[in-house]
Amino acid sequence: QGGAAEGVQIQIIYFNLETVQVTWNASKYSRTNLTFHYRFNGDEAYDQCTNYLLQEGHTSGCLLDAEQRDDILYFSIRNGTHPVFTASRWMVYYLKPSSPKHVRFSWHQDAVTVTCSDLSYGDLLYEVQYRSPFDTEWQSKQENTCNVTIEGLDAEKCYSFWVRVKAMEDVYGPDTYPSDWSEVTCWQRGEIRDACAETPTPPKPKLSK
């Protein structure tokens, strides 16, 4: 996502429409304290970053408070007074939604409905991944709201679940980030478990009458 002006690579992450993190990787300036200057409005004067990220004792990024800003971030990374990278971006194209909160499971026979608190903004996908020890890989289902029903589960099997939120690429573009996964929770016969056994337990033999 960062063009390489004078060998500077940048990364922007807009955490849950609250905080913007801009980091840079500038091999040419690896031992230099580059400064970060920004504004949210093309008409304003630039402010300098007050919350730098450091790597090996040198500036490598900036954290900005930008709660629910529907703005463009205009920024300049400078070596002294010399700009080494200047750009402007809609921050929302680099959205990383927050991890799902208040995840709940509602079981009904061979199906489970996973719900969580919807985020306050839209054009998101709520993805539930699940697997049993019998599965070689995670299965996935996603919906536009955090209300995802998965059917056809085996009530006798133990299943692990986790949930995340993704910005719709169609709307926000290709440079967003999925949220972190929620904690893994394990369920068997509609009851929560500490864990699912890594090696599947063989099915109990059916007793003939």
Epitope: Q1, L17, Q68, D70, I72, R89, V92, Y93, D123, D175
Partner: antibody, heavy 125, light 106 residues
Framework: QIQLGQSGPELKKPGETVKISCKAS????????MSWVKQAPGKGLQWMGW????????RYADDFKGRFAFSLETSASTAYLQIYNLKNEDTATYFC??????????????????WGQGTLVTVSA | DIVMTQSHKFMSTSVGDRVSITCKAS??????VAWYQQKPGQSPKLLIY???TRHTGVPDRFTGSGSGTDFTLTLNNVQSEDLADYFC????????FGSGTKLELK
């Protein structure tokens, strides 16, 4: 289906004021922002700015600050463009076009999928 | 403002030909580029967004490509109904349009 219907052509004298309407239907009006685009005769497209239909807050492109005003009549799902103190160079077709972003979140002016049919404003003494 | 330059004001083609319309941004815009088709007396119609995603209902003979500063709209097997003006637009920051390229018959 989603439609944006604009008011009819206007013939005005320099110094007068014009108000163009854009009535939206087929979706929840306050969910998506509305942009305005100018096209002078035989020329290209110029983004004039947009209005957040949820908050009513307008944003104007640099070339359209001063004599131009965006407004809303939310109950009628209608956006307005008003141009004051008209000049000859304001002669153009003006389009309203719906934003692709949900306005309760962000105002990123993205791709424009839905357009009004355009309103021709002619300014002539 | 970011300037979008369409260097060819006119491009001549024949039905069945392949034609490429180019657009250059004055600074890196990532893939935040759309392409529109406009016919005389009509509103612009979205063809491509995010540089290469075809909008719903747009024939697959229209293809967008590019990232950063250089973008191309390619029309394969040009049809007579494709003769129109084509505009690129960036939306990495406040939107700006290219000046347009008119596709006409040879």
């Amino acid at each position: 289906q989603i439609q944006l219907g604009q008011s009819g052509p206007e013939l005005k004298k320099p110094g007068e004021t014009v108000k163009i309407s854009c009535k939206a239907s087929g979706y929840t009006f306050t969910t998506y922002g509305m942009s305005w685009v100018k096209q002078a005769p035989g020329k290209g497209l110029q983004w004039m700015g947009w209005i957040n239909t949820y908050s009513g807050v307008p944003r104007y492109a640099d070339d359209f600050k001063g004599r131009f005003a965006f407004s809303l009549e939310t109950s009628a799902s209608t956006a307005y463009l008003q141009i004051y103190n008209l000049k000859n160079e304001d002669t153009a077709t003006y389009f309203c076009t719906r934003e692709g972003f949900i306005t309760t979140v962000v105002g990123a002016a993205g791709r424009f999928v839905y357009w009004g049919q355009g309103t021709l404003v002619t300014v002539s003494a | 403002d970011i300037v979008m330059t369409q260097s060819h004001k006119f491009m001549s083609t024949s039905v069945g030909d392949r034609v490429s319309i180019t657009c250059k941004a004055s600074q890196d815009v990532g893939t935040a580029v759309a392409w529109y088709q406009q016919k005389p007396g009509q509103s612009p119609k979205l063809l491509i967004y995010w540089a290469s995603t075809r909008h719903t209902g747009v024939p697959d003979r229209f293809t967008g490509s590019g990232s950063g500063t250089d973008f191309t709209l390619t029309l394969n097997n040009v049809q007579s109904e494709d003769l129109a003006d084509y505009f690129c637009q960036q939306y990495s920051t406040y939107p700006t349009f290219g000046s347009g390229t008119k596709l006409e018959l040879k």
